[in-house]
């Protein structure tokens, strides 16, 4: 039984449109078939959960209707997409990884990722 | 705020039952996992059985497998801990601790005494 | 299972001195680590988490260290309400368990 290792990118730039992506990797010390994936954001020593998906290994990941997240997993690498972001969601965010199923549970958490989002300038008026 | 109060302790005879609930609230209880922890008189922390976002998600230390019964009620924001086959080494105080998002245990009950002897 | 030791079983000190408690895993716990600090009839409180992070509200007179299996936390300076028992728990791995504790006491 070893710790289990999270990694993840330490910068993202979102996009104008406010979308920032990055990969979460995790080192699976046994043949989990369920597994949870968190995202939490980090502000000055506030920890808040942003959004949460559980999926078995080989399937999609599924998220609240209503999350900002979406995401995709390839064997143990989870591509999360958060969306809606804007300059005030500038901040660090983590990657929780749980293996749920079968038994014995395992914990991961990542260092996070600096996400950077920039509100795009409004469009200057045009003169016709 | 956060406030978890167990409760259900007391004396009871070897071989016999109880159930300890722990009311949680200032919460989204449903979003985090919940964990029984324990302390005999003059002894260190031992933590007993831990259970996760969805009720089928369970953990129990050796010395609780097969007697006790870790629930939850996501309806009534309430843990529970139904032990059965009590001996006089299940005395102890018991502790409700939540599982902060970060892993470790960051709130925790005051404790409820549970006195198992004849 | 992960066993985890602590030392020494008490210290003894005066308010002022510093406080340094040890606690050693049987195998790597990565940073998996947290301190709580227990004091008579009451709940433990945490005080450490993920080896070196202050919990809310905790003063920086506390302060966490290590890695691996060795992990350390530290009191700067002892303050009169500082005397307790202090116990490591590592969180990362089923099941989780916490060390034997360590009683820091006024000499």
């Known amino acids: 039984c070893k710790a289990m290792h999270v990694a993840q990118p330490a910068v993202v730039l979102a996009s104008s449109r406010g979308i920032a992506s990055f990969v979460c990797e995790y080192a699976s010390p046994g043949k989990a078939t369920e597994v949870r994936v968190t995202v939490l954001r980090q502000a000055d020593s506030q920890v808040t959960e942003v959004c949460a998906a559980t999926y078995m290994m080989g399937n999609e990941l599924t998220f609240l209707d209503d999350s900002i997240c979406t995401g995709t997993s390839s064997g143990n690498q989870v591509n999360l997409t958060i969306q809606g972001l804007r300059a005030m969601d500038t901040g660090l965010y983590i990657c929780k990884v749980e293996l749920m199923y079968p038994p014995p549970y395992y914990l991961g958490i990542g260092n996070g990722t600096q996400i950077y989002v920039i509100d795009p300038e409004p469009c200057p008026d045009s003169d016709f | 705020q956060v406030q978890l109060v167990e409760s259900g302790g007391g004396v009871v005879e070897p071989g016999r039952s109880l159930r300890l609930s722990c009311a949680a609230s200032?919460?989204?209880?449903?979003?985090?996992?919940m964990h029984w922890v324990r302390q005999a008189p003059g002894k260190g922390l031992e933590w007993v059985a831990v259970?996760?976002?969805?009720?089928?998600?369970?953990d129990y230390a050796d010395s609780a497998k097969g007697r006790f019964t870790i629930s939850r009620d996501n309806s009534k924001n309430t843990l529970y801990l139904q032990m059965n086959s009590l001996r006089a080494e299940d005395t102890a105080v018991y502790y409700c601790?939540?599982?902060?998002?970060?892993?470790?245990?960051?709130?925790w009950g005051q404790g409820t005494l549970v006195t198992v002897s004849s | 299972e992960i066993v985890l030791t602590q030392s020494p079983g008490t210290l003894s000190l005066s308010p002022g001195e510093r406080a340094t408690l040890s606690c050693r895993a049987s195998q790597s716990l990565n940073s998996y680590l947290a301190w709580y600090q227990q004091k008579p009839g009451q709940a433990p409180r945490p005080l450490i988490y993920g080896v070196s992070s202050r919990a809310t509200g905790i003063p920086d007179r506390f302060s966490g260290s290590g890695s691996g299996t060795d992990f350390t936390l530290t009191i700067s300076r002892l303050e009169p309400e500082d005397f307790a028992v202090y116990y490591c728990q590592q969180y990362g791995i089923y099941p989780f368990t916490f060390g034997p504790g360590t009683k820091v006491d006024i000499k």
């Open positions: 259970i996760w976002y969805k009720s089928s998600e369970k």
């Open positions: 200032g919460f989204t209880f449903s979003s985090y996992g």
């Open positions: 601790a939540r599982a902060g998002l970060l892993g470790y245990f960051d709130y």
